[in-house]
């Protein structure tokens, strides 16, 4: 017969033949043969493969450098790569997840619309018409300003984006 | 055609140096594990040691072969060495290479080695 | 090193025999082990490798069990052609920084 020109998939074409690819958490050791299926091993300790490969080596898993702020989210196994985030108050500077930056402060004026995650920043928004915030903070949310109605008593100071209103008593009316 | 063809082999004096060579052909050489394996005459096959495929191939060997027994491999002339040092008249025997770690599918016809004063 | 200890070490048999080797490794190596025929003057020839699977062209009378640290040889109806030394290979992996390979002793079948 015609030696094959294309493989099935899971496959890989050499020496003009078919082998099967080694599956996920196995490296190539041999080719197969006219007579034998292809060799493969399992990756070893702290080693990888996530695809049907003919790989002769396994990738290293990642290493989470606690230097870098960074430490273990999900442990690699032969099959998949160590998942790596970042510790409390930090977050990833980059999807790969190499190295961490603290989460940044949202300044008076604005407020803290998304809380930063081990992969994401904090996201502030600046406070709109009746609300303010007043410290830098990576968790507070813009605060409504108070109602001064509500409280039986009068706007003696205008709220601003970093400011509450100041209420104070009314003014009562002389008869 | 498939094979393997060993060279080299032939008589030395005790602590003297042999370099056999292995030449492999019709066959993908860089992608597979290569194995040299001995035989004492009247004896059962001894394993020599192993070196894995890729470019940077790890190597293992025998503990009785560590430091006097090196193997190497030439890709680009898809040729398999063992270089012998410090031979003595136990390593008299019929060197094999063969294709394969853990398994090994395809063995040349063997180079003789004779150690002897 | 693993040790590979096989038995017996010879055997008589008549064509037409079931006959039985079995191969003991020191450690457990799965089932990375593979059985080789030997004729006089020849290199070794592989019979089954991964503990069970046999080569295409090798005939079915083969087969091999076993995982772990016990194989077994099983040729289920002894041919003139069968009679050879048998020699078990076992290998051992430990995934980290070394891998080793033996051989058993051998086993030769003769005619009975």
């Known amino acids: 017969p015609e030696p094959p020109t294309a493989c099935r998939e899971k496959q890989y074409l050499i020496n003009s033949q078919c082998c099967s690819l080694c599956q996920p958490g196995q490296k190539l050791v041999s080719d197969c043969t006219e007579f034998t299926e292809t060799e493969c091993l399992p990756c070893g300790e702290s080693e990888f493969l996530d695809t049907w490969n003919r790989e002769t080596h396994c990738h290293q898993h990642k290493y989470c450098d606690p230097n870098l702020g960074l430490r273990v989210q999900q442990k690699g196994t032969s099959e998949t790569d160590t998942i790596c985030t970042c510790e409390e108050g930090w977050h990833c500077t980059s999807e790969a997840c190499e190295s961490c930056v603290l989460h940044r402060s949202c300044s008076p004026g604005f407020g803290v619309k998304q809380i930063a995650t081990g992969v994401s920043d904090t996201i502030c928004e600046p406070c709109p018409v009746g609300f303010f915030s007043n410290v830098s903070s990576a968790f507070e949310k813009c605060h409504p300003w108070t109602s001064c109605e509500t409280k039986d008593l009068v706007v003696q100071q205008a709220g601003t984006n970093k400011t509450d209103v100041v209420c104070g008593p009314q003014d009562r009316l002389r008869a | 055609e498939v094979q393997l063809e060993e060279s080299g082999g032939g008589l030395v004096q005790p602590g003297g140096s042999l370099r056999l060579s292995c030449a492999a052909s019709?066959?993908?050489?860089?992608?597979?594990?290569m194995s040299w394996v001995r035989q004492a005459p009247g004896k059962g096959p001894e394993w020599v040691v192993t070196i894995y495929a890729g470019s940077s191939g790890s190597t293992y060997y025998a503990s009785w072969a560590k430091g006097r027994f090196t193997i190497s491999k030439d890709t680009s002339k898809t040729t398999l060495y063992l270089q012998m040092n410090s031979l003595r008249a136990e390593d008299t025997a019929t060197y094999f290479c063969a294709r394969g770690a853990t398994y090994l599918t395809l063995w040349g016809q063997g180079t003789l080695v004779t150690v002897s004063s | 090193d693993i040790v590979m200890t096989q038995s017996p070490s010879s055997l008589s048999a008549s064509v037409g025999d079931r006959v039985t080797i079995t191969c003991q490794a020191s450690q457990s190596i799965s089932n990375y082990l593979s059985w080789y025929q030997q004729k006089p003057g020849q290199a070794p020839k592989l019979l089954i490798y991964r503990a069970s699977t046999l080569p295409s062209g090798v005939p079915s009378r083969f087969s091999g069990s076993g995982s772990g640290t016990d194989f077994t040889l099983t040729i289920s109806s002894l041919q003139p052609e069968d009679f050879a030394t048998y020699y078990c290979?076992?290998?051992?992996?430990?995934?980290?920084?070394?891998?080793?390979?033996?051989f058993g002793q051998g086993t030769k079948v003769v005619i009975k």
């Open positions: 019709g066959f993908s050489f860089s992608s597979n594990a």
């Open positions: 290979q076992g290998y051992y992996y430990s995934g980290t920084t070394y891998d080793s390979t033996a």
